[in-house]
């Protein structure tokens, strides 16, 4: 099992759309594949794929998940908010017929505020 994730770096504007792709390849056929997307180490969703279909279509806030045979798992964030910024990792495991797992490399998502002054104020504001 191998997992290739892309892009490595994604910079989008707040309110637009971000697409993260995970390519999951296995040399032999599989009956059930467990997939997982994490953001900054926290699980966003953990559905499985069987009979060509995802068990879940949503993945985290404003996240939509899709599977395109033979190997493409797509996470679409729409609309993107500032809170979506972070490090995303795709993980996959063949559950049936036998356990094998792999994960992709990090996709770093940077979200630019619609109002550039928001970014300046956010960086400049310190607690206390």
């Amino acid at each position: 099992l191998s997992v290739q994730q892309g892009p490595n770096l994604l910079q989008v504007r707040q309110g637009s759309q971000a697409t993260l792709v995970c390519q999951v390849d296995q040399a032999t056929a599989w009956e059930r594949l467990r997939v997982k997307w994490t953001k900054d180490g926290a699980i966003l969703c953990q559905p499985y794929i069987t009979n060509g279909s995802l068990s879940l279509g949503v993945c985290g806030p404003q996240g939509r998940l899709s599977w395109q045979a033979p190997s493409h798992l797509t996470l679409q964030l729409d609309p993107v908010s500032l809170n979506h910024s972070g490090a995303y990792v795709c993980w996959a495991a063949v559950e049936i017929p036998e356990l094998e797992e792999a994960e992709g490399n990090i996709t770093r998502l940077f979200v630019d505020p619609d109002d550039p002054t928001q970014n300046r104020n956010r960086i400049a504001s310190f607690p206390g």
């Epitope: 032999t28 009956e31 094998e100 792999a102």
Partner: antibody, heavy 120, light 113 residues
Framework: QVQLQESGPGLVKPSQTLSLTCTVS??????????WSWIRQHPGKGLEWIGY???????YYNPSLKSRVTISVDTSKNQFSLKLSSVTAADTAVYYC????????????WGQGTMVTVSS | DIVMTQSPLSLPVTPGEPASISCRSS????????????LNWYLQKPGQSPKLLIY???TRASGVPDRFSGSGSGTDFTLKISRVEAEDVGVYYC?????????FGDGTKLEIK
């Protein structure tokens, strides 16, 4: 361009262990997503898959040979090996090493094969 | 184990004529998850190692002449050569990659009449 070359003794005595090595050139054996396999062909017969090892070290063997087979990888030498224990005359065959990618479920590169005879 | 059955075992063909080889598997090689048939075809020319011709039942491998074509799905597959040439002689094998153990058909020996 990936090339595979089998090497090892052409004659093995019954009950001994057959040891073959496949040297990979033009490609790193530790590349993610690739499997390294052994396949044999008895004289005048068809092809029999022995097993393969993947980039993570996971091994998959033909159940008919599993108790006697070990496939391992030496990344420092860019080689992978086959050991088949307790051989008999029925193990006399041409042994091929081959490779495939997770992305594509087929053997796209093969070695030229090495003939191994089991005889006393 | 999945059993692969090829027919015919021997195939004498006149150059320029078409040829067809059948391969049947004891269970379906189609996966709805990947929308693929895990069936490959190889040609082993005399004294050589096998060479990939067709993968996923119908996709020609790089460098393979377009006179070779693969078709079928599930359990029934066919390799066709539209016009046989002298260089096509050898043994043709079908092979499944659906699960381990991987198994091959017994082979079809194509010879020139």
């Amino acid at each position: 361009q990936v090339q595979l070359q089998e090497s090892g003794p052409g004659l093995v005595k019954p009950s001994q262990t057959l040891s073959l090595t496949c040297t990979v050139s033009g490609f790193s054996i530790s590349t993610s997503g690739y499997y390294w396999s052994w396949i044999r062909q008895h004289p005048g017969k068809g092809l029999e898959w022995i097993g393969y090892i993947n980039y993570g070290g996971g091994t998959y063997y033909n159940p008919s040979l599993k108790s006697r087979v070990t496939i391992s990888v030496d990344t420092s030498k860019n080689q992978f090996s086959l050991k088949l224990s307790s051989v008999t005359a029925a193990d006399t065959a041409v042994y091929y090493c081959a490779t495939m990618a997770d992305r594509f479920a087929f053997f796209d590169v093969w070695g030229q094969g090495t003939m191994v005879t089991v005889s006393s | 184990d999945i059993v692969m059955t090829q027919s015919p075992l021997s195939l004498p063909v006149t150059p320029g004529e078409p040829a067809s080889i059948s391969c049947r598997s004891s269970q379906s090689l189609f996966s709805s998850n990947t929308n693929r048939n895990y069936l490959n075809w190889y040609l082993q020319k005399p004294g050589q190692s096998p060479k990939l011709l067709i993968y996923h039942a119908s996709t020609r491998a790089s460098g393979v002449p377009d006179r070779f074509s693969g078709s079928g799905s599930g359990t029934d597959f066919t390799l066709k050569i539209s016009r046989v040439e002298a260089e096509d002689v050898g043994v043709y094998y079908c092979q499944h990659h659906y699960e381990t153990p991987l198994t091959f058909g017994d082979g079809t020996k194509l010879e020139i009449k």
